[in-house]
Interface confidence: low
């Protein structure tokens, strides 16, 4: 069956729903699970055969203001001898997340949801070879 | 990031913090980017630490479909196509923000929720603990 989108539902609307002006939605930005922690293996970004660095991007008109982006350190992958092997490729793994964007229009402030593509880390892949006919 | 200067004629009500509750436009910017990782790349098959993608569906959430990665092997695939257990396939996890319908089933009322997803896998050198 069709997956309901934001603003559309196949559920019966309960009486307790807050009134919302047309064309907009109410968003509580007090985050559920705010204090949960990522329990990733230690230092995987430097132990990986496709290592990466982290860069923090900061924007005061975005919520959350800090978004961490990964960047692959090499184009190739690190082999057993610790050297870059360019017969393999380090590639970014990306994931979408939502942010709230604050926009100033004259004296009024409006808020917009935005999908942001975050690079999470890198993985080592066998390259696709295009053979010329 | 740049703070956009306000019109000097505006009342001085600039708040650097976001309010707890905001009214947001129903149209999500960049909404139509491809959310199916199987369609966007085949890294999950070509990686030396390949993974399977599992569909996680929740109609009370936006986006309602999230793909979770699960590493196929404990080790990594070597040049001969065999699993090398001297290396480890590990998941790369990321906290993302989604919308949770609150109160439940309401069409236009949401709360931000932080969830942890495994996005893919990477091949790492294992941490070896030597017994004294």
């Amino acid at each position: 069956r069709k997956i309901p989108k934001v603003g559309h539902t196949f559920f019966q609307k309960p009486e307790s729903c807050p009134p919302v002006p047309g064309g907009s939605m109410k968003l509580d930005i007090g985050i559920i699970n705010e204090n949960q922690r990522v329990s990733m293996s230690r230092n995987i970004e430097s132990r990986s055969t496709s290592p990466w660095n982290y860069t923090v991007t900061w924007d005061p008109n975005r919520y959350p203001s800090e978004v961490v982006q990964a960047q692959c350190r090499n184009l190739g992958c690190i082999n057993a001898q610790g050297k870059e092997d360019i017969s393999m490729n380090s590639v970014p793994i990306q994931q979408e997340t939502l942010v709230v964007r604050r926009k100033h229009q004259g004296c009024s402030v409006s808020f917009q949801l935005e999908k942001v593509l975050v690079t999470v880390g890198c993985t080592c892949v066998t390259p696709v070879i295009h053979h010329v006919q | 990031g740049i703070t956009i200067p306000r019109n000097p004629g505006c009342p001085n009500s600039e708040d650097k913090n976001f309010p707890r509750t905001v009214m947001v436009n129903l149209n999500i910017h960049n909404r139509n980017t491809n959310t199916n990782p199987k369609r966007s790349s085949d890294y999950y098959n070509r990686s030396t630490s390949p993974w399977n993608l599992h569909r996680n569906e929740d109609p009370e959430r936006y986006p309602s479909v999230i793909w979770e990665a699960k590493c196929r092997h404990l080790g990594c695939i070597n040049a001969d196509g065999n699993v090398d257990y001297h290396m480890n396939s590990v998941p790369i996890q990321q906290e993302i923000l989604v919308l949770r319908r609150e109160p439940p089933h309401c069409p236009n009322s949401f709360r931000l929720e932080k969830i942890l997803v495994s996005v893919g896998c990477t091949c790492v050198t294992p941490i070896v603990h030597h017994v004294a």
């Epitope: 960047q71 350190r73 184009l75 | -």
Partner: antibody, heavy 124, light 111 residues
């Protein structure tokens, strides 16, 4: 907007010194490796030097080794090129350029942002 | 003496495909990926391609690259008048311990 602005060029006599500066803005300068590249009038591009994001590693072209020194002040978002014992063949437009990815990169992602250049003329 | 060799010039009419070769050695192209730069007269160089055929944003997909052994090439398909510029290949050279540029190729759009 990411910008690099070179300064310090001018006319100088052979054997003298000059210090070029490159002011960076619009990005986290301390995260990126930086290069100097020069171009003699009517000639091609010639690489001069590179410095790692934290200043710990420096590499030079053979033609300037021992005479030029690349350095950076991350607190001032500024890259420098100290040029000593200048020769007529050092006459060129000098560009500073940013490495295209943060961290331990020197070249893999290319030089993605360039300044407009500053002209150095070595003549008696 | 540049470590990377390019033809001094190449030309084509609008819509045609032009290829520029870049020849090196094991210590540079043989070991590292090649970057390509475009420089229009009077302006600073601009990064055109890097890595394994990756394009910075804003660079049209008419530009493509290939790399094999100790040589690389840049192809410009559907040639346009704004493609008239100097093109440089560049990469790291292990022997020199530094970045090295090709000698440059001037592309002329005829007609």
């Amino acid at each position: 907007e990411v910008q690099l602005l070179e300064s310090g060029g001018g006319v100088v006599q052979p054997g003298r010194s000059l210090r070029l500066s490159c002011a960076a803005s619009g990005f986290i300068f301390s995260n990126y490796g930086m290069h100097w590249v020069r171009q003699a009038p009517g000639k091609g591009l010639e690489w001069v030097a590179v410095i790692s994001y934290d200043g710990s590693n420096k590499y030079y072209a053979d033609s300037v080794k021992g005479r030029f020194t690349i350095s950076r002040d991350n607190s001032k978002n500024t890259l420098y090129l100290e040029m000593n014992s200048l020769r007529p063949e050092d006459t060129a437009v000098y560009y500073c350029a940013k490495v295209g990815a943060s961290g331990d990169y020197y070249y893999s992602y290319g030089l993605d942002v360039w300044g407009q250049g500053t002209t150095v003329t070595v003549s008696s | 003496q540049s470590g990377l060799t390019q033809p001094p010039s190449a030309s084509g009419t609008p819509g045609q495909t032009v290829s520029i070769s870049c020849s090196g050695s094991n210590s540079n192209i043989g070991s590292h990926s090649v970057n390509w730069y475009q420089q229009v007269p009077g302006a600073a160089p601009k990064l055109l391609m890097y890595g394994i055929g990756q394009r910075p944003s804003g660079v049209p997909d008419r530009f493509s690259v290939s790399q094999s052994g100790t040589s690389a090439s840049l192809a410009i398909s559907g040639l346009q008048s704004e493609d008239e510029a100097d093109y440089y290949c560049a990469t790291w050279d292990d022997s020199l311990g530094g970045y090295v540029f090709g000698s440059g190729t001037k592309v002329t759009v005829l007609g």
